[in-house]
Interface confidence: low
């Protein structure tokens, strides 16, 4: 058993047939010594008396809010949550496996630049009685500070018969060094509580591996005289790291016809302009990627040819 | 060229070669980006590689103030990786595919280190750890880890030379 936060405790249980469970001793936080009784949740049934209560925690029916009272007055509470280990593996029931980039990916994170700011998100099908708490650090043995905000519900989607809820959190490394080569990964730890079930999820990454620039901005076409060619120009996204002479991007320019089956013409360039042939009913799209490190491409920015 | 006396390197040449190094490092092991090598054991094997750290002066401001600190650190790293790529880890079993870019990568590391430090000038270079894995599968894993770490190192080096070529060239 360990303390998650004030008056909230997590009991780690091997979820086995006939498992003896864990013996837990609760102590009433009061100077009082006599006349103390204990109850669980909303029930008025007295579970025991005295300053301490010893219970055998085996299943969810044994978890919940234990309250000690004296003469009708509440003295203190202890909330017991369960963390299940099933067949040797900690349960991961609350969050959905996003399966990208690999199986058992529950947390996904992205950064728009090298400033040390990043966003993580996760999915669940649970709509109520759900809380999350996020902590992060750079490295684990001698951790350096990363500050995370509160996790918020950022999207709701319908997937078949189910509703899916996306939560996200923003974090910022306290003393980020954008130009350095990272040697210690960022660690992100999410505590999830659904009703009386506790689970924890972790992710470990380098900022360089989760970089995904915003799409290029101000995408414009300039027709070239007496030619089917156009000059496409764009600018670095505002959110990208500066100076651009140091934090450089590379770009992919694509000409795509109306039909998905039409052949796509692609040009790769380090410049912020390119000359392409603009076909009727086609569109021109540009996306960006770090020039020197193959992290994710940005989403496309597009303009119609006409 | 970056010499102990402090003259400037051939920024544009260094920029071109370091960008080529980035391309080669990714083509040598493109899928490495999808493998979480930190989950595999053997952490100590790649902990000794020289990293370009915050105090090494490789940020735009540091380069403007005095690029020598940064260039020395980059040179140190290039020599380190050049030796690793020439070691038993890469030359031993299992053999590399004939068209593997590791050979080119090895040569380019040497080429860039020579651009930074011509014959007759010697910066202190870091000791290469004695990495001789007992099993071929350990060797493969080490290759992946070294290439992964090299990709991060050359990315920073390429940014340094690109910025230098754009802002510090005579």
């Amino acid at each position: 058993i360990w303390e998650l936060k004030k008056d909230v405790y997590v009991v780690e249980l091997d979820w086995y047939p006939d498992a003896p469970g864990e013996m837990v001793v609760l102590t009433c936080d009061t100077p009082e010594e006599d006349g103390i009784t204990w109850t669980l949740d909303q029930s008025s049934e007295v579970l025991g008396s005295g300053k301490t209560l010893t219970i055998q925690v085996k299943e969810f029916g044994d978890a919940g809010q234990y309250t000690c009272h004296k003469g009708g007055e509440v003295l203190s509470h202890s909330l017991l949550l369960l963390h299940k280990k099933e067949d040797g593996i900690w349960s991961t029931d609350i969050l959905k496996d996003q399966k990208e980039p690999k199986n058992k990916t529950f947390l996904r994170c992205e950064a728009k630049n090298y400033s040390g700011r990043f966003t993580c998100w996760w999915l669940t099908t649970i709509s109520t009685d759900l809380t999350f708490s996020v902590k992060s650090s750079r490295g684990s043995s001698d951790p350096q500070g990363v500050t995370c905000g509160a996790a918020t519900l950022s999207a709701e989607r319908v997937r078949g018969d189910n509703k899916e809820y996306e939560y996200s959190v923003e974090c910022q490394e306290d003393s980020a060094c954008p130009a350095a080569e990272e040697s210690l990964p960022i660690e992100v730890m999410v505590d999830a509580v659904h009703k009386l079930k506790y689970e924890n999820y972790t992710s470990s990454f380098f900022i360089r591996d989760i970089i995904k620039p915003d799409p290029p901005k101000n995408l414009q076409l300039k027709p070239l005289k007496n030619s089917r060619q156009v000059e496409v120009s764009w600018e670095y996204p505002d959110t990208w790291s500066t100076p651009h002479s140091y934090f450089s991007l590379t770009f992919c320019v694509q000409v795509q016809g109306k039909s998905k089956r039409e052949k796509k013409d692609r040009v790769f360039t380090d410049k912020t302009s390119a000359t392409v042939i603009c076909r009727k009913n086609a569109s021109i799209s540009v996306r960006a990627q770090d020039r020197y490190y193959s992290s994710s491409w940005s989403e496309w920015a597009s303009v119609p040819c006409s | 060229r970056a010499v102990p006396g402090g003259s400037s390197p051939a920024w544009t040449q260094c920029q071109q070669l370091s960008q080529k190094l980035c391309t080669l490092a990714w083509s040598a092991h493109p899928l490495v980006g999808h493998m979480d090598l930190r989950e595999e054991g053997d952490e100590e094997t790649t902990n000794d590689v020289p990293h370009i750290q915050c105090g090494d002066g490789c940020d735009p401001q540091g380069l403007r103030d005095n690029s020598q600190f940064c260039l020395q650190r980059i040179h140190q790293g290039l020599i380190f990786y050049e030796k690793l790529l020439g070691s038993d880890i890469f030359t031993g079993e299992p053999s590399l595919l004939p068209d593997s870019p590791v050979g080119q990568l090895h040569a380019s590391l040497l080429g860039l280190s020579q651009l930074l430090q011509p014959e007759g000038h010697h910066w202190e270079t870091q000791q290469i750890p004695s990495l001789s894995p007992s099993q071929p599968w350990q060797r493969l894993l080490l290759r992946f880890k070294i290439l992964r770490s090299l990709q991060a190192f050359v990315a920073v080096a390429a940014r340094v030379f690109a910025h230098g070529a754009a802002t510090l060239s005579p």
Epitope: D14, W15, Y16, P17, F60, E86, D87, G88, I89, D93 | -
Partner: antibody, heavy 114, light 112 residues
Framework: EVQLVQSGAEVKKPGASVKVSCKAS????????MNWVRQAPGQRLEWMGV????????TYNQKFKGRVTITVDTSASTAYMELSSLRSEDTAVYYC???????WGQGTLVTVSS | DIVMTQTPLSLPVTPGEPASISCRSS???????????LNWFLQKPGQSPQLLIY???TRASGVPDRFSGSGSGTDLTLKISRVEAEDVGVYYC?????????FGSGTKLEIK
């Protein structure tokens, strides 16, 4: 008393699919994972996969590469195991086993023959 | 996958005598929490397997105390102190330390 009752024996042709059911009683169905294990004649037991009935989350043995699908109907306290693209070597007794492997179904014999 | 190697394949025993079955794992099943994630089963002819021992040494409910489990992280043993006629069948070990869970090839216990 905990009981796992499986559907009856099946005979299938190669290439077909089979869906075996496992009805649970005597306990709260959503409190326990359900495993599926098979045993070909004279062979060792082979774990196929597991499902968490509460959330429908599954983990499969990669040996069955996309051929196995485990599902649940919580309202009926029933777990299902579907195996597709059947071949003769899939002839086996298929068992469901509750989390912890203390409780097993009686087994379902699936025969694959042309 | 973790490979479970069981010996012997066949074990003829006289009633009242002890019996010992060995199981070797290709990877340690002893985890940081101090538990060894190994089960032992008995499958009697025409029946489903029944759990005898879990977590290497804990007897399942209703299992007689003549059955005991022991071992290290990779070398595991099931002992029957005095074999009885009802103990005949095939004994299997199973690791549940990692997915996919894997079983030993089985040991057939027969009465001499």
């Amino acid at each position: 008393e905990v009981q796992l009752v499986q559907s009856g024996a099946e005979v299938k042709k190669p290439g077909a699919s089979v869906k075996v059911s496992c009805k649970a009683s005597g306990y709260s169905f959503t409190d326990h994972n359900m495993n599926w294990v098979r045993q070909a004649p004279g062979q060792r037991l082979e774990w196929m996969g597991v499902i968490n009935p509460n959330y429908g989350t599954t983990t499969y043995n990669q040996k069955f590469k996309g051929r196995v699908t485990i599902t649940v109907d919580t309202s009926a306290s029933t777990a299902y195991m579907e195996l597709s693209s059947l071949r003769s070597e899939d002839t086996a007794v298929y068992y469901c086993a509750r989390r912890g492997f203390a409780y097993w179904g009686q087994g379902t014999l699936v025969t694959v023959s042309s | 996958d973790i490979v479970m190697t069981q010996t012997p394949l066949s074990l003829p025993v006289t009633p009242g005598e002890p019996a010992s079955i060995s199981c070797r794992s290709s990877k340690s099943l002893l985890y940081k929490d101090g538990k060894t994630y190994l089960n032992w089963f008995l499958q009697k002819p025409g029946q489903s397997p029944q759990l005898l021992i879990y977590l290497m040494q804990t007897r399942a409910s209703g299992v007689p105390d003549r059955f005991s489990g022991s071992g290290s992280g990779t070398d595991l043993t099931l002992k029957i102190s005095r074999v009885e006629a009802e103990d005949v069948g095939v004994y299997y070990c199973q690791q549940i330390a990692e997915y996919p869970f894997t079983f030993g090839s089985g040991t057939k216990l027969e009465i001499k």
